[in-house]
């Protein structure tokens, strides 16, 4: 079994989590990728996923989550904008590779969001940016129902996510367009 490691990100409300998940581009460039949250005692929940096959550098936005898959670089960029305290939790990037089990990328992310004014609103990049705009995109992202031989119960897929605009106030703890996806390592 792969040793699971966690990387802690401590950010303030209003800031942006910006994670770069690397992958072997020759193997996984066009594979569908997802961003999941892992709650204690539960299966990982998929919050957002890229299209299938994944489109190069095409942003997928689900509420305050933006995924960008850079095939040329073997890099999945995940951003969670306008962070809220309730977003705190354990997250991970995965690659869907049916019929095999999902492949976990990178370290798991332990996100801790605290209240308080951020000197760099909307970013965790130490104020080095001079341009940072979230484009008002609308993307339908259908995340697959993943069946694992080790999983006996499986939630049926709900409606496809169709959430737009950067100021969409979706509380990630109450996202309804979620599919439970088992991840084994």
């Amino acid at each position: 079994a792969t040793k699971l490691t966690e990387e802690k990100y401590e950010l303030k409300e209003g800031q942006t989590l910006d994670v770069k998940c690397d992958y072997t581009l020759e193997k996984f460039a066009s594979s569908q990728k997802a961003w999941q949250i892992i709650r204690d005692g539960e299966m990982p929940k998929t919050l957002a996923c890229t299209e299938r096959p994944s489109k190069n550098s095409h942003p997928v936005q689900v509420g305050r989550i933006i995924l960008e898959d850079y095939h040329d670089h073997g890099l999945l960029r995940v951003r969670m904008v306008n962070l809220q305290v309730e977003d705190s939790g354990l997250y991970q990037c995965v690659i869907y590779q049916p019929p095999k089990e999902p492949h976990m990328l990178f370290d798991r992310i332990r996100l801790v969001v605290t209240k308080g004014f951020s000197g760099t609103p909307g970013s965790n990049e130490n104020s080095t940016q001079n341009v940072y705009k979230i484009p008002p995109t609308t993307t339908k992202a259908l995340c697959p129902l993943y069946t694992s031989p080790r999983t006996v119960t499986q939630a049926p897929p709900k409606s496809t996510a169709d959430v737009s605009t950067p100021d969409s106030e979706i509380n990630l703890t109450n996202v309804t367009d979620i599919i439970r996806v088992p991840v084994f390592n």
Epitope: E7, K20, Y23, S57, D72, N126, K133
Partner: antibody, heavy 116, light 107 residues
Framework: EVQLVESGGGLVQPGGSLRLSCAAS????????MSWVRQAPGKGLDWVAS????????YYVESVKGRFTISRDNAKNSLHLQMNSLRAEDTAVYYC?????????WGQGTLVTVSS | EIVMTQSPATLSVSPGERATLSCRAS??????LAWYQQKSGQAPRLLIY???IRATGIPARFSGSGSGTEFTLTISSLQSEDFAVYYC?????????FGGGTKVEIK
Amino acid sequence: EVQLVESGGGLVQPGGSLRLSCAASGFTFSSNWMSWVRQAPGKGLDWVASIKQDASEIYYVESVKGRFTISRDNAKNSLHLQMNSLRAEDTAVYYCVRGGWRFESWGQGTLVTVSS
Amino acid sequence: EIVMTQSPATLSVSPGERATLSCRASQSVSSNLAWYQQKSGQAPRLLIYGASIRATGIPARFSGSGSGTEFTLTISSLQSEDFAVYYCQQYKNFPLTFGGGTKVEIK
């Protein structure tokens, strides 16, 4: 084959300006972040600036903020670096590179010398 | 700003021997670390990204390891074309920062 060809370097006096250009080919320019990285003579590598495909995100190293401007023309597959108020410490080979975080492909570089 | 420190500054190795280069970050960069090779008079070339993933076309004798703040580039059996300067670079956060480099020279 990916090709990145820089131009526009040369000798300039302190306080002067230069505009570097980079002609890109062999890949889908409009789908890639692009950056400039520099290397002072006999020294190591220093990141200068990065720009997203649609220029919606631009980042600079602190020492060039307010003096340098990175831009791109996706229709012409070209990347630019406008350098104003140049200082002696800006003397370096400037590389045009593909990527916004790590750098998969590099040009051969163009030398910028700031001296009186 | 994340400071990257490489050691040693110079490494003298005989052809066919193993070379181990170290890179340390002043704070955790997770696995967002790349290694580059630069030969004299040439532009750098990406060797490793994601701390341990070989870039396209890079020989298997190059391997990377580590996570967080401590990273290693290993060249299992040095070939004549491997004598060069090697740089590590973090890309967890802007500003992107490089290490000062390790020169691998012939012993």
